[in-house]
């Protein structure tokens, strides 16, 4: 028979309050005959945690059937973990003795420490929108975790970011810790549909990291481009002028027509369409009455986007003599 070894594979076991902790212990030999007991701590003051032979341990159950003759697994489960349960646990083999069993060999011990899961990461973007090519900052926060070791990563559309700074507080010993990270992201014109993700990995999460997200649509403003055109065809005595407002975000937009500097109050037809990249196009049609006394008409399409300074485009209406003639002919 090989000499008996006591195997406690985990040096550290992180447990959560209220959960069940499993402390592993196996032996490599059935000999010498004698019980395996569990203790917390060492020396004369050690606390008996489990003794199969005698005592009442309502929170402790064995993983294996200890009554089986060939059993070599003496692992235990402790239910309803509280902060008072932290410490180093030893499985100890006793050899039969008379009148008392004699301690034979101890396992190396497993330290049980309280682990607390981090809270779901919260990602906050900038207070105000910014235009493409500029840099914006996002912050990610997670709280209440223990132990202190934690990993945080940033992603934009699945691509890992490198421009960020992370702090874990406090720096000294604590029951629980917090993490705060700030990432700098350069905005692209197509970022309306983009997402930034803050990913937090911690030993208590068992390889399943927590993620917090923020949509760049909340942080970006894509200013519109304007184009005013006159339609070649006229309808009766009216000429159709179009103002195309392209590639803007967000949707918030005010469009006004001016005729020779005078704001027009009358209804105009318009359509709003969404582009694949999440930006919008707005098309507005303005009908201008053509008469003899109107030789030079300047139309202005003015757009106020998302509370910014208004931008405008002007068009000098081209009305040919032929068009005028047709117009006067058409008027009864």
């Amino acid at each position: 028979e090989e000499e008996l070894q006591m195997i406690q594979p985990e040096k550290l076991l992180l447990v959560t309050v209220g959960k069940t902790a499993t402390l592993h212990c196996t032996v490599t030999s059935l000999l010498p005959v004698g019980p395996v007991l569990w203790f917390r701590g060492v020396g004369p003051g050690r606390e008996l945690i489990y003794n199969q032979k005698e005592g009442h341990f309502p929170r402790v159950t064995t993983v294996s059937d200890l009554t089986k003759r060939n059993n070599m697994d003496f692992s235990i489960r402790i239910s309803s973990i509280t902060p008072a349960d932290v410490g180093t646990y030893y499985c100890v083999k006793f050899r039969k003795g008379s009148p008392e069993n004699v301690e034979f060999k101890s396992g190396p011990g497993t330290e049980m420490a309280l682990g607390a899961k981090p809270s779901a990461p919260v990602v906050l973007g900038p207070a105000a929108r910014t235009t493409p090519e500029h840099t914006v900052s996002f912050t990610c926060e997670s709280h209440g975790f223990s132990p202190r070791d934690i990993t945080l990563k940033w992603f934009k559309n699945g691509n890992e970011l490198s421009d960020f700074q992370t702090n874990v507080d406090p720096t000294g010993q604590s029951v629980a810790y917090s993490i705060r990270s700030t990432a700098r992201v350069v905005l692209d014109p197509w970022d309306v549909r983009s997402q930034v993700i803050c990913e937090v990995a911690h030993v208590t999460l068992q390889g399943d990291p927590l993620r917090g997200t923020a949509n760049l649509s909340e942080a970006i403003r894509v200013p519109p481009t304007l184009e005013v055109t006159q339609q070649p065809m006229r309808v009766g005595n009216q000429v159709n002028v179009t103002c195309q407002v392209r590639k803007f975000y967000p949707q918030s937009l005010q469009l006004t027509w001016s005729e020779n500097g005078n704001v027009c109050q009358r209804e105009t037809a318009s359509t709003l369409t969404e582009n694949k990249d999440g930006t919008y196009n707005w098309t507005s049609w303005f009908l201008v009455n053509i008469s003899d006394q109107r030789d030079d008409v300047v139309l202005t399409c003015q757009v106020k986007h998302d509370g910014q300074l208004a931008v405008s485009k002007r068009l000098a209406l081209e009305v040919t003599v032929h068009q005028k003639d047709q117009s006067s002919d058409a008027t009864p």
Partner: antibody
């Protein structure tokens, strides 16, 4: 304390299957291993195997290929079947209990109560 | 496989002490049991876990086990103690019996 009463066919022909049953009276059926031991005429004791209430078995390696020990907890009985018997299987067969209760560990319990024994003869 | 060896016979005068030995490799690391069997009867457990007596077994029966040898001692042997005695131990979930010792009370 537990008491054991055993029965089964006493005379067998070679190649037949020996079948014995042991009834348990008193005690908690779930805190024991239940054993079968045999003793050929004029010789010593030979352990055949054991079973507990959940059906966990251990067998003597020399007999393992021919032995089945089963348990019927509803009747508080356990049984032995030994197949393909020969004259060498002629013996007194005993059932015995091993009490482990709640305060024991592996190999700390032996055979504390024995049945009255059943003489089995294998002859052509 | 594990083996337990007993001397086939021991003789003792009434009132004297009889010692029956059982040897096996590192037997002291295991528990030893002792059974008494009288002619035509079922075995009876007389010592369990090396040195413990079941209720109903007289105090003159005692046991010890260390090294490679377990010993059953009967002090003040009586004629009624004449019987076959078997030691037993466990090896890898298998019960192993010694060959038995016939105790004769002269």
């Amino acid at each position: 304390q537990v008491q054991l009463q055993q029965w089964g066919a006493g005379l067998l022909k070679p190649s037949e299957t020996l079948s014995l049953t042991c009834a348990v009276y008193g005690g908690s059926f779930s805190t024991y291993y239940w054993n079968w031991i045999r003793q050929p005429p004029g010789k010593g004791l030979e352990w055949i195997g054991e079973i507990n209430h959940s059906g966990s078995t251990n067998y003597n390696p020399s007999l393992k290929s021919r032995v089945i020990i089963s348990v019927d907890t509803s009747k508080n009985q356990f049984s032995l079947k030994l197949s393909s018997v020969t004259a060498a299987d002629t013996a007194v067969y005993y059932c015995a209990s091993s009490h482990y209760g709640s305060g024991s560990f592996p190999d700390s319990y032996g055979m504390d109560v024995w049945g009255q024994g059943t003489t089995v003869t294998v002859s052509a | 496989s594990y083996e337990l060896t007993q001397s086939p016979s021991v003789s003792v005068s009434p009132g004297q002490t009889a010692s029956i030995t059982c040897s096996g490799d590192k037997l002291g690391d295991r528990y030893a049991w002792w059974y008494q069997q009288k002619p035509g009867q079922s075995p009876v457990l007389v010592i369990y876990q090396d040195d413990k007596r079941p209720s109903g077994i007289p105090e003159r029966f005692s046991g010890s086990n260390s090294g490679n040898t377990a010993t059953l001692t009967i002090s003040g042997t009586q004629a009624m103690d004449e019987a076959d005695y078997y030691c037993q131990a466990w090896d890898s979930s298998t019960a192993v019996f010694g060959g038995g010792t016939k105790l004769t009370v002269l």
